[in-house]
C-alpha cells in the first residue's frame, strides 16, 4: 500500500567463510531523501524503546558516516535509489538476517534481508535434461547461487576427472533479482559417455579447489556392437565354411531383437547372434553386418566383407567403338568376374593370340582394316584360368579399295564407237551405294558401276570413277585413246606471202589440227584432178592457167578428211588483146561502126587507150570505140592498149573498111 | 629384301641444323601399317628414340627434342628426312633409322640401318 | 614418359652360364616390351618382341618373360658370340623409350 517503502533486493544471499557478499538493492522512500542508515546483524524491535536492537554493522548520519568493522561493510548507495551493499570479507557468524534501518524526514523502515553464509564454500548444482541420447546435442548447466564482485570464482568442467575440451559459456549476474554463477556446456555425448562421471568444480581466482557438484550421464543408444569371423580375414574359397558372431559391447536400454544383413537385405531366419554360412558360394560375397535394436532403434555392426575367391568366368569383351573408322583408335575391354581380380590377360584375334597384350585393356592407336574381327580374351588370376568367351565383333569401316576404272570395248576406241567403261574396286565397307565419273556428261549407267557413252567425241580424252559407300574413293583417270580422222584440214599459202603474180613461185601447205593415229598422207586435187601427195604443193613459176579451186585431203587409218575448196587467184598483165569490129570489119558510111578492145587480164583492165594507123591516140578510154555516123576517112587501122595494176597490154591492128554508100556513089 | 641406309654430314658446326635422310627399300611407306624410325646414341651411352613416322603421315617426337625435331617423308623416292636445329656438342651421336612394325600398334623395330656418326663442333 | 631401368649395369658369366637380365617400367606396359642385342659399331638387332616372342632367326637359347612392369631376358647356356650390351625398350606409349643397357663380358 502507499503507506510501505518500496524495496527490490535478493531475498536472500549464499557466501562462505572469508569470501564476500554483494547485496544488490533499490528502494523508493516514501517522502524526501535518506537522512539516516543503520544495518543490523539480526534486529529484534524492542516495544518498551520503540527502537529496534542488534548488532549494527554500519550506520550512516546526517554527521556523516562511522567507521565501523574496519570498513568490512560498505554502504554503496545514495539516499534516494541505490542501497547496495557490500560486506568483505564475510564470516560465519554473518549468517542470520541483515536490516537495513532507513529514515527519512518523517518516515523510517526497516527492510530484512537473509543472509546464508557456510563454513566451507557450498557446491554448485549440475542441472541435465530430461534424456540424453547419444549424438544429440544437450546442455548441461552448472549453477552456483554466488557471486561478488571482490572474490572472483570459476567453474570447470570435468568428464571422468578430466577437463573437457568442449568451450563452456560462463555468465554472472548481480542483479535485484538474482545473484549466481552459471557455467552452460553444449556437449554431444556418445554412447561410451554412458556411465561416465561429469564434475562442476568450483575454483577460486588460482584454479585451487573449493567445491564439485558430480552427475552420472545416463546416455542412450542403439546396440553398440562386435563382429567377428571366422576365418579372420574372411577370404574364403568356393566350398568353405564362414562363421561370424555379434557381440553387444553395449546398449541402453537392454536389445530385444537380432538380424542379419547382407549388403544391406536382411537375411531371412537369422535371428541369432551367430551366423554359419556353408558350403560357400560366390554369390555370398559380400558385405555382411548384424543388427541388433532396442527401444532407440537399430544398431549395426561394422561390416564384414566376405570374398568368396574363384578363378575367372568366360570372358566378354567390350569394344569402343565399333563400328571403327579405318585411322581412328579402339580400345578394348576385357570383362571377366573373378576374386581375386585377374592378374594377367591373354587377347585373341580371330582366334590368333595378339602378341604383347596382357592388360586387361588393349589400345589400337590406329585401327587398319585387316582389324577387323572377332576379338577374345582369357582372365588369369591365382585361382586359375577362365574360359575364352564368345568375342566381340570389331567391323571396320573403310573407303572403298584399289579403284580402277576399266575400258570394256575392244582397242582401239574410234571415233562415234559406243564406249562401255566398269568402275572396279577391291574392297569396301561399308558397301558401295553409288558412283562417280569425271567429266560429266550426257552418258548413260546402264547399271551400277557401269558407264556407256553414245557417239564417243574425239576429244573425249580421259575418264576417271570414282567408288562411293560412306567416302568416295577416286580411280586413276584412264585415257579413252579415242582414234579419229585428221580434224580441220585446209589449204593455208605459205608463199608468197603477198598476192600471187604469174611467174611468181608458189607453196600451199595441207593443215589440220589433230590426228589419231598420227600417220597421215596427203592428196591435192584440182577439179577432181589428182596433182600431188605431199603435204605441201609448189609451183616454180605460177601461170594464169594454174588459177582454180584447189582441195586437199588428209588421211589415216581411221577415215579422210578434205579441206573446203581453196580458189587459187594469179594476177597478170592484159594479154591477148585484139580490136574486134561489130557489125563487121567492111560497113558503109553513115552507118554506126563499134570497135571493142578485148582482153585476157587479172584484175580485169582498169584502162583503154585507142591508137589510129598514124599510132596517134584517140581521146577515147572505155573498152567500147563507138564511130557513129561512120564516115569513109574513118577507114583505116586501129589498135587498143589495156592497163591494169599489173602491167599493160597492146593488140595488133584491126582495119576498118568504110565503104561509100549507094547515095554517094549515086551522087557521084 | 628391306634395307635401310642413313645418309648426311658427318660434321656439324654448333647451332647449324642437321639433316639427314633415310633411303629404304624392299617396303613402302605408303603401305598401311609402315613406319619409320629415328634413334640416336651418343659414344658409349644409351639408345634415344626421336622421332617416327607412319604411312598416314602422323608424326610423333621425343617429348624433350619436340621443338627442335621435323619428321616428313617423300614415298615415290622412299626416303625419310630428319631435321635438327640448334645443334650443340652433346648432340654428337650415331644417328640409326629403323623400320617399325606396326601390329596393334607401334610394335617393334625390325629392320635398321647401319647408322651414321654425326660430330657437333664449336 | 615411361622411365626403363636395367639390372645389372654390366655383368660378367662363362661360356656355358644361364644369363638373366632384368627390366623394370616405372608403369605398368602390358606385354609391349622388346629386347635388342648391340654389338660394338653395329645397329642394334630384335631378339625378342611383346616380351616372349621370339624373332625369327634369332637362336632359341635367348628367351623373355614377364608382363606389367617386371620384364627378364635370359640366355640359357651363354655363347662367345652373345657378348654384347642388351637393351630394353617400351612401345606401349609414347615417347618409346628403351633402358640404359647391360654389358655382358666372358669371364
Known amino acids: 500500500d502507499s503507506s510501505k517503502w518500496v524495496f527490490e533486493h535478493p531475498e536472500t544471499l549464499y557466501a562462505w567463510e572469508g569470501a564476500c557478499v554483494w547485496i544488490p538493492c533499490t528502494y523508493r522512500a516514501l517522502d524526501g531523501d535518506l537522512e539516516s542508515f543503520i544495518l543490523f546483524h539480526n534486529p529484534e524491535y524492542n516495544k518498551n524503546t520503540s527502537k529496534f536492537d542488534g548488532t549494527r554493522l554500519y550506520e550512516s548520519t546526517k554527521d556523516g558516516k562511522v567507521p565501523s568493522e574496519q570498513k568490512r561493510v560498505q554502504f554503496l548507495g545514495d539516499k534516494n535509489k541505490n542501497c547496495t551493499l557490500s560486506i568483505h570479507p564475510v564470516h560465519l557468524n554473518d549468517s542470520g538476517q541483515l536490516g537495513l534501518r532507513m529514515e527519512s524526514k518523517t518516515e523510517k523502515w526497516m527492510e530484512r534481508i537473509h543472509l546464508n553464509v557456510s563454513e566451507r564454500p557450498f557446491p554448485p548444482h549440475i542441472q541435465l535434461p530430461p534424456e540424453i541420447q547419444e549424438s544429440q546435442e544437450v546442455t548441461l548447466t552448472c549453477l552456483l547461487n554466488f557471486s561478488c564482485y571482490g572474490y572472483p570464482i570459476q567453474l570447470q568442467w570435468l568428464l571422468e576427472g578430466v577437463p573437457m575440451r568442449q568451450a563452456a559459456v560462463t555468465s554472472t549476474s548481480l542483479t535485484i533479482k538474482s545473484v549466481f554463477t552459471r557455467s552452460e556446456l553444449k556437449f554431444s555425448p556418445q554412447w561410451s559417455h554412458h556411465g561416465k562421471i561429469v564434475t562442476c568444480q568450483l575454483q577460486d581466482a588460482d584454479g585451487k579447489f573449493l567445491s564439485n557438484d558430480t552427475v552420472q550421464l545416463n546416455v542412450k543408444h542403439t546396440p553398440k556392437l562386435e563382429i567377428k569371423v571366422t576365418p579372420s580375414d574372411a577370404i574364403v574359397r568356393e566350398g568353405d565354411s564362414v562363421t561370424m558372431t555379434c557381440e553387444v559391447s553395449s546398449s541402453n536400454p537392454e536389445y530385444t531383437t537380432v538380424s542379419w544383413l547382407k549388403d544391406g537385405t536382411s537375411l531371412k531366419k537369422q535371428n541369432t547372434f551367430t551366423l554359419n554360412l556353408r558350403e560357400v558360394t560366390k554369390d555370398q560375397s559380400g558385405k555382411y553386418c548384424c543388427q541388433v535394436s532396442n527401444d532407440v532403434g537399430p544398431g549395426r555392426s561394422e561390416e564384414v566383407f566376405l570374398q568368396v575367391q574363384y578363378a575367372p568366368e568366360p570372358s566378354t569383351v567390350q569394344i569402343l567403338h565399333s563400328p571403327a573408322v579405318e585411322g581412328s583408335q579402339v580400345e578394348f575391354l576385357c570383362m571377366s568376374l573373378a576374386n581375386p581380380l585377374p592378374t594377367n590377360y591373354t587377347w585373341y584375334h580371330n582366334g590368333k593370340e595378339m602378341q604383347g597384350r596382357t592388360e586387361e585393356k588393349v589400345h589400337i592407336p590406329k585401327i587398319l582394316p585387316w582389324h577387323a574381327g572377332t576379338y577374345s580374351c582369357v582372365a588369369e588370376n591365382i585361382l586359375g584360368t577362365g574360359q575364352r568367351g564368345p568375342g566381340a565383333e570389331l567391323d571396320v569401316q573403310y573407303p572403298p579399295k584399289k579403284v580402277t576404272t576399266v575400258i570394256q570395248n575392244p582397242m582401239p576406241i574410234r571415233e562415234g564407237d559406243t564406249v562401255t567403261l566398269s568402275c572396279n574396286y577391291n574392297s569396301s565397307n561399308p558397301s558401295v551405294t553409288r558412283y562417280e565419273w569425271k567429266p560429266h556428261g550426257a552418258w548413260e549407267e546402264p547399271s551400277l558401276g557401269v558407264l556407256k557413252i553414245q557417239n564417243v567425241g574425239w576429244d573425249n580424252t580421259t575418264i576417271a570413277c570414282a567408288a562411293c559407300n560412306s567416302w568416295c574413293s577416286w580411280a586413276s583417270p584412264v585415257a579413252l585413246n579415242v582414234q579419229y580422222a585428221p580434224r580441220d584440214v585446209r589449204v593455208r599459202k605459205i608463199k608468197p606471202l603477198s598476192e600471187i603474180h604469174s611467174g611468181n613461185s608458189v607453196s600451199l601447205q595441207c593443215d589440220f589440227s589433230s590426228s589419231h593415229p598420227k600417220e597421215v598422207q596427203f592428196f591435192w586435187e584440182k577439179n577432181g584432178r589428182l596433182l600431188g601427195k605431199e603435204s605441201q604443193l609448189n609451183f616454180d613459176s605460177i601461170s594464169p592457167e594454174d588459177a582454180g579451186s584447189y582441195s586437199c585431203w588428209v588421211n589415216n587409218s581411221i577415215g579422210q578428211t578434205a579441206s573446203k575448196a581453196w580458189t587459187l587467184e594469179v594476177l597478170y598483165a592484159p594479154r591477148r588483146l585484139r580490136v574486134s569490129m561489130s557489125p563487121g570489119d567492111q560497113v558503109m558510111e553513115g552507118k554506126s561502126a563499134t570497135l571493142t578492145c578485148e582482153s585476157d587480164a587479172n584484175p580485169p583492165v582498169s584502162h583503154y587507150t585507142w591508137f589510129d594507123w598514124n599510132n596517134q591516140s584517140l581521146p577515147y578510154h572505155s573498152q567500147k570505140l563507138r564511130l557513129e555516123p561512120v564516115k569513109v576517112q574513118h577507114s583505116g587501122a586501129y589498135w587498143c592498149q589495156g592497163t591494169n595494176s599489173v602491167g599493160k597490154g597492146r593488140s595488133p591492128l584491126s582495119t576498118l573498111t568504110v565503104y561509100y554508100s549507094p547515095e554517094t556513089i549515086g551522087r557521084r | 629384301q628391306v634395307t635401310l641406309r642413313e645418309s648426311g654430314p658427318a660434321l656439324v658446326k654448333t647451332t647449324q641444323t642437321l639433316t639427314l635422310t633415310c633411303t629404304f627399300s624392299?617396303?613402302?611407306?605408303?603401305?598401311?601399317?609402315?613406319?619409320v624410325s629415328w634413334i640416336r646414341q651418343p659414344p658409349g651411352k644409351a639408345l634415344e628414340w626421336l622421332a617416327l613416322?607412319?604411312?598416314?603421315?602422323?608424326?610423333y617426337y621425343s617429348t624433350s627434342l619436340k621443338t627442335r625435331l621435323t619428321i616428313s617423308k617423300d614415298t615415290s623416292k622412299s626416303q625419310v628426312v630428319l631435321t635438327m636445329t640448334s645443334m650443340d656438342p652433346v648432340d654428337t651421336a650415331t644417328y640409326y633409322c629403323?623400320?617399325?612394325?606396326?601390329?596393334?600398334?607401334?610394335?617393334?623395330?625390325?629392320?635398321w640401318g647401319q647408322g651414321t656418326l654425326v660430330t657437333v663442333s664449336s | 614418359d615411361i622411365q626403363m631401368t636395367q639390372s645389372p649395369s654390366s655383368l660378367s658369366a662363362s661360356v656355358g652360364d644361364r644369363v638373366t637380365i632384368t627390366c623394370r617400367a616405372s608403369?605398368?606396359?602390358?606385354?609391349?616390351l622388346n629386347w635388342y642385342q648391340q654389338k660394338p659399331g653395329k645397329a642394334p638387332k630384335l631378339l625378342i618382341y611383346?616380351?616372349?616372342s621370339l624373332q625369327s632367326g634369332v637362336p632359341s637359347r635367348f628367351s623373355g618373360s614377364g608382363s606389367g612392369t617386371e620384364f627378364t631376358l635370359t640366355i640359357s647356356s651363354l655363347q662367345p658370340e652373345d657378348i654384347a650390351t642388351y637393351c630394353c625398350?617400351?612401345?606401349?606409349?609414347?615417347?618409346?623409350?628403351f633402358g640404359q643397357g647391360t654389358r655382358l663380358e666372358i669371364k
Open positions: 629403323a623400320r617399325i612394325r606396326y601390329i596393334y600398334g607401334y610394335d617393334y623395330f625390325d629392320y
Open positions: 624392299g617396303f613402302s611407306l605408303s603401305t598401311s601399317g609402315m613406319c
Open positions: 613416322i607412319d604411312w598416314d603421315d602422323d608424326k
Open positions: 608403369q605398368r606396359i602390358s606385354s609391349q
Open positions: 611383346a616380351a616372349s
Open positions: 625398350q617400351q612401345t606401349y606409349s609414347k615417347p618409346i623409350t
